[in-house]
Amino acid sequence: MAVTACQGLGFVVSLIGIAGIIAATCMDQWSTQDLYNNPVTAVFNYQGLWRSCVRESSGFTECRGYFTLLGLPAMLQAVRALMIVGIVLGAIGLLVSIFALKCIRIGSMEDSAKANMTLTSGIMFIVSGLCAIAGVSVFANMLVTNFWMSTANMYTGMGGMVQTVQTRYTFGAALFVGWVAGGLTLIGGVMMCIACRGLAPEETNYKAVSYHASGHSVAYKPGGFKASTGFGSNTKNKKIYDGGARTEDEVQSYPSKHDYV
């Protein structure tokens, strides 16, 4: 039960985290105009990974995409790449973890397979979270560097804008969303890895049960050969003596009185 809860919680936390990473990547407010030196501005600038925006006090907002690819700073490209890799890995991790969930039964999937899938998705979530945290941290570092270097006609890291002295940029909401989301994805991944350990029981216990079963459960019916192995009718066409993990509905069931003459 604890394993199922840990796995389920890990999945939900990772899902929220990945949704946050996607949101952060799409957000325009990665960097926002620092109003410390100019609190009376009637024009507010903010920038994202994909476009820069200007909000006027009139309420009108104008956004322009970075339509160049080669003209963008390498750091910005690197941040984009990290965030996209994080999203892709997270999405694949979510897909894998859905099939790995203990509460979902798919065909004849064994616990060993579910354990492996849980571990795989957990690792993917961890890497996804680390990618997001790294991406956001690289961007934050870039902002800090540019903040102190913000002088007239300096080519800054946001879409190749020429800055004037007054305009400095500080951390935007997307950075905090990204950090939190990356952290949640990371935590979710760790939880999945912990759940994986609980899903894969020690093999020796199962082997002992298997040998015990094979020695005592052969029954005979009048007019036939070996009628039962003591593990039910094996309707799922599973290998019985595989020495591996079994799902809860495959626990050993000894022959009932109806199996005897």
Partner: antibody
Framework: EVQLQQSGPELVKPGASVKMSCKAS????????MHWVKQKPGQGLEWIGY????????RYNEKFKGKATLTSDKSSSTAYMELSSLTSEDSAVYYC???????????WGQGTSVTVSS | DIVMTQSPSSLTVTAGEKVTMSCKSS????????????LTWYQQKPGQPPKLLIY???TRESGVPDRFTGSGSGTDFTLTISSVQAEDLAVYYC?????????FGSGTKLEIK
Amino acid sequence: EVQLQQSGPELVKPGASVKMSCKASGYAFTSYVMHWVKQKPGQGLEWIGYINPYSDGTRYNEKFKGKATLTSDKSSSTAYMELSSLTSEDSAVYYCTRIYYGNAMDYWGQGTSVTVSS
Amino acid sequence: DIVMTQSPSSLTVTAGEKVTMSCKSSQSLLNSGNQKNYLTWYQQKPGQPPKLLIYWASTRESGVPDRFTGSGSGTDFTLTISSVQAEDLAVYYCQNDYSYPFTFGSGTKLEIK
């Protein structure tokens, strides 16, 4: 058609208060910020402040803080400006104006003339 | 506060003539985010409220005749009337739209001979 209809002229005594109105029509009142501008006879224009009818947020020129109070009523699409402790210096025409792209004032009311005289 | 200085304070021209008037701001009105200058020009005819002519320093408001042209960047701006008409008799104001408080120039009065 966008229209800003301002209240009629006011003749008030020094020390008194006056509240003028600006009724907006022809557009979504809460979608545009409303600014107020003062013009003394034969002189230039002076920005007083603005009110955002959507949020009721206001901003004032430091010079008019304590003098002007901006309010709005969404239900009647009307903006108000109250001037307190009036002196002869407050005798002027007061305009309400809608703000547009580039923070430019694209539509203006016809103005409310305030005369402070004993 | 940003100080707006207009020159000349008045000028008298004949119809059909080209007119230029200047507006200088004490600080740059250029916004780096969109490379636009937050300067607006208004025309005020006697007994009327001001009328918007030009915003973003050079964008003509719809319905404004194309003889009116705004130019300049940073701190120096110009309004040009390519061929003055009798109905252009008015006072022209420039305004800082970049930071609060919004400030207006003292105006340039255009008179027709």
